[in-house]
């Protein structure tokens, strides 16, 4: 009643290993690490067989099959490459996830290397079974912005891709008779969020009252260079319009707002976000040079069709930029106090421009970002938003442009963008 001697499967073993197996003896077939028992198209960790009364084994010895992790999952804004020849997906094979550079960067700076584990899952040393996250790269235009040593007076044409965060905001307030139309600028913060000035998104229908425009009345254009040709631009409607709750229309304190886009926009050479500064009350230091871009829409009677389709009656069809130095708070405050008026340059504002004036102070559209290069992180950062002073007193002597100090609002911005009310949770990698 002895059963025949057993031969262990390739990449496997039999336990217990005996010289003789008699009736009722049982053996357990198992496979080496990275292999699984294959029996009748079923995969299992172990398989038990028994020596029967008639001297035969209850089952044939199964085979050991190498673990296969299968095709790796796709990565949003990224791609996967196989490190092993023939695109193998079996045990100990390697794959590498990478993000669509230079527009996306991997969160946590992981290697992106995943190995097929013995359990049949793609595994990373740090992230384990979780996939990496590709976040938008901010403040790194595909074209290098001009060095800031040379001073530019007045505006210069911006080459396509120099200010990929620049947004044109078009508002058509149909609740008014006649329909009201106006424009402003904004800056892309992520695939779904635009930063702008609150006054751009406030309806002037009621004085002394902050009435935000309806989201239905807002259109945002990104990747727009020449207002006469919007074919290459991405246009998006708004899902939410969020004005800072303390925005004051009398002195433009807290002049900051967000627009959440209806759908995330695809990033590319002409559409990339700007970085937010670190949350610090100081803001940019005096004499630091920053850039502001805008189409300088000077004629307010221009219609949406004219601006978007033909670009007529604007200061420039092509996006312009200007370089301006930050002015000390004390000097700016004094310059406005000397003008006799209810002007207050608060701690939530900073000023930029030249004492002798010039058209440079009015080129940036309201809501556009005043960007400064951060040497430490090697990114461009939105330190300010075009708020008041300059845009309406275009180039007057000793009338500095006043900008919203974005660093005072970083916590508020993140809070709003990550709140449950937001349609999506979004981050940006710096």
């Amino acid at each position: 009643n002895e059963c025949p001697k057993l031969q262990p499967p390739v990449y496997g073993k039999i336990e217990p290993s005996q010289a003789v197996y008699s009736f009722k003896d049982q053996v357990l077939v198992s496979c080496d690490t990275g292999y699984k028992v294959l029996k009748d198209n079923g995969v299992m960790d172990t398989f038990q067989i028994e020596c029967l009364k008639d001297g035969a084994w209850s089952n044939k010895i199964p085979t050991c099959k190498i673990v296969d992790c299968g095709a790796p999952a796709g990565l949003k804004h990224g791609l996967v490459t196989f490190s092993t020849r023939n695109n193998l997906t079996t045990y100990k094979s390697e794959i590498r996830y990478s993000c669509q550079q230079p527009y996306y960067k991997m969160l946590h700076n992981t290697t992106g290397v995943y190995t097929c584990s013995a359990h049949g899952t793609w595994t990373n040393e740090v992230l384990k079974r979780s996939l990496p996250t590709c976040l938008p790269v901010c403040g790194q235009p595909s074209r290098a912005l001009p060095n800031l040593v040379k001073r530019i007076i007045g505006g210069r044409n911006a080459e396509l891709g120099l200010f990929p965060w620049q947004a044109l905001i078009v508002v058509e307030d149909t609740s008014r008779v006649p329909n009201d139309k106006w424009f402003g600028s904004g800056a892309l913060l992520s695939e779904s969020w635009i930063l702008t000035a609150a006054h751009v998104l406030r309806s002037q229908r009621r004085d002394n009252t902050v009435i935000p425009v309806s989201k239905e009345h807002v259109t945002v254009y990104l990747g727009l260079h020449d207002v006469r040709d919007k074919s290459g631009a991405v246009n998006s409607s708004a899902a939410r319009v969020i004005l800072h709750p303390d925005f004051n229309i009398q002195n433009y304190n807290h002049d900051i707002a967000l627009v959440q886009l209806q759908k995330p926009v695809p990033l590319g050479a002409h559409v990339m976000p700007i970085c937010l500064p670190r949350p610090e009350p100081e803001g940019p230091a005096p004499h630091m040079l920053g850039l502001v871009a805008g189409w300088g829409i000077s004629n307010p009677n221009v219609t949406v069709d004219e601006i978007i389709l033909s670009g007529t009656r604007t200061l420039s069809d092509v996006l312009q930029y200007v370089k301006l130095p930050v002015v000390s708070h004390a000097e700016c405050k004094a310059s406005y106090e000397s003008r006799s008026g209810n002007y207050s340059v608060t701690e939530n504002m900073f000023c930029a421009g030249y004492y002798e004036g010039g058209k440079d102070t009015c080129l940036g559209d309201s809501g556009g970002a005043f960007v400064i290069f951060d040497e430490m992180s090697q990114h461009w950062v939105a330190q300010g938003l075009v708020s008041w002073g300059g845009p309406e007193e275009c180039g007057s002597k000793q009338v500095y442009g006043v900008y919203t100090k974005v660093s005072n609002y970083v916590d508020w911005l993140w809070e709003e963008m990550n709140s449950p009310r937001a349609v999506r949770d979004l981050q940006v990698e710096r």
Epitope: V171, R176, V177, P178, N179, D180, K181, W182, H199, Q204, R205, R206, D207, N208, T209, I249, Q250, N251, Y252, N299, P300, N301, R339, S340, G341, N342, Y343, S366, W388, P391, E392
Partner: antibody, heavy 116, light 112 residues
Framework: QIQLVQSGPELKKPGETVKISCKAS????????MSWVRQAPGKGLKWMGW????????TYADDFKGRFAFSLETSARTPYLQINNLKNEDTATYFC?????????WGQGTSVTVSS | DVLMTQTPLTLSVTIGQPASISCKSS???????????LNWLLQRPGQSPKRLIY???KLDSGVPDRFTGSGSGTDFTLKISRVEAEDLGVYYC?????????FGGGTKLEIK
């Protein structure tokens, strides 16, 4: 501190055109609309309409549609009222007032006399 | 258009005495936003108008507290607790709720 300074008096003939200015100072100009109000000699006040100083879009009361035009020179912080094809009944003092509806500060008024 | 009716047409008051002006609108001035855009202004002789009261009862800065505004819906009142010489002129109410905004005919306050 907040001031609206209007242009001087005008003497015009019927059929001519007049353009009145209203220079604003002491506040953020594009934050408030600007209204225009007419006061005929010895009469009360009549609201003509307003202009959105941010968008430049004018809104006219029905009685002032056609010959009347509001415009802006934002960089000079100056709204304008233009009356075309003047008639004798346009003889009045014209005021600009800050705000589309609030009208919290008023200009000193511009007297327009239309006489042949 | 909303008709604004002011009474009386003329008011003769002795200095130090109270005065009251009524303003009635042909329809309610309560706006959909919950506010009532009823305002009062004073036009002194030979001068431009000056706003005194907005949103029915809010006093403009620099306006003496002897002025009070009250009312709701279609009936509004401006009261002066003790008239002073500088108060003479024509008082107008106006509404900013229904387009186009309309003024009352004015009430001339003269000193007895």
């Amino acid at each position: 501190q907040i001031q609206l300074v209007q242009s001087g008096p005008e003497l015009k003939k019927p059929g001519e055109t007049v353009k009145i200015s209203c220079k604003a100072s002491g506040y953020i100009f594009t934050s408030y609309g600007m209204s225009w109000v007419r006061q005929a000699p010895g009469k009360g006040l009549k609201w003509m309409g307003w202009i959105n100083t941010y968008s430049g879009v004018p809104t006219y009361a029905d009685d002032f549609k056609g010959r009347f035009a509001f415009s802006l020179e934002t960089s000079a912080r100056t709204p304008y009222l233009q009356i075309n094809n003047l008639k004798n009944e346009d003889t009045a003092t014209y005021f600009c007032a800050r705000g589309g509806e609030a009208m919290d500060y008023w200009g000193q008024g511009t007297s327009v006399t239309v006489s042949s | 258009d909303v008709l604004m009716t002011q009474t009386p047409l003329t008011l003769s008051v002795t200095i130090g005495q109270p005065a009251s002006i009524s303003c009635k609108s042909s329809q309610s001035l309560l706006d959909s936003d919950g506010k009532t855009y009823l305002n009062w202004l004073l036009q002194r002789p030979g001068q431009s108008p000056k706003r005194l009261i907005y949103l029915v009862s809010k006093l403009d800065s620099g306006v003496p507290d002897r002025f009070t505004g009250s009312g709701s819906g279609t009936d509004f009142t401006l009261k002066i607790s003790r008239v002073e010489a500088e108060d003479l002129g024509v008082y107008y109410c106006w509404q900013g709720t229904h387009f186009p905004w309309t003024f009352g005919g004015g009430t001339k306050l003269e000193i007895k």
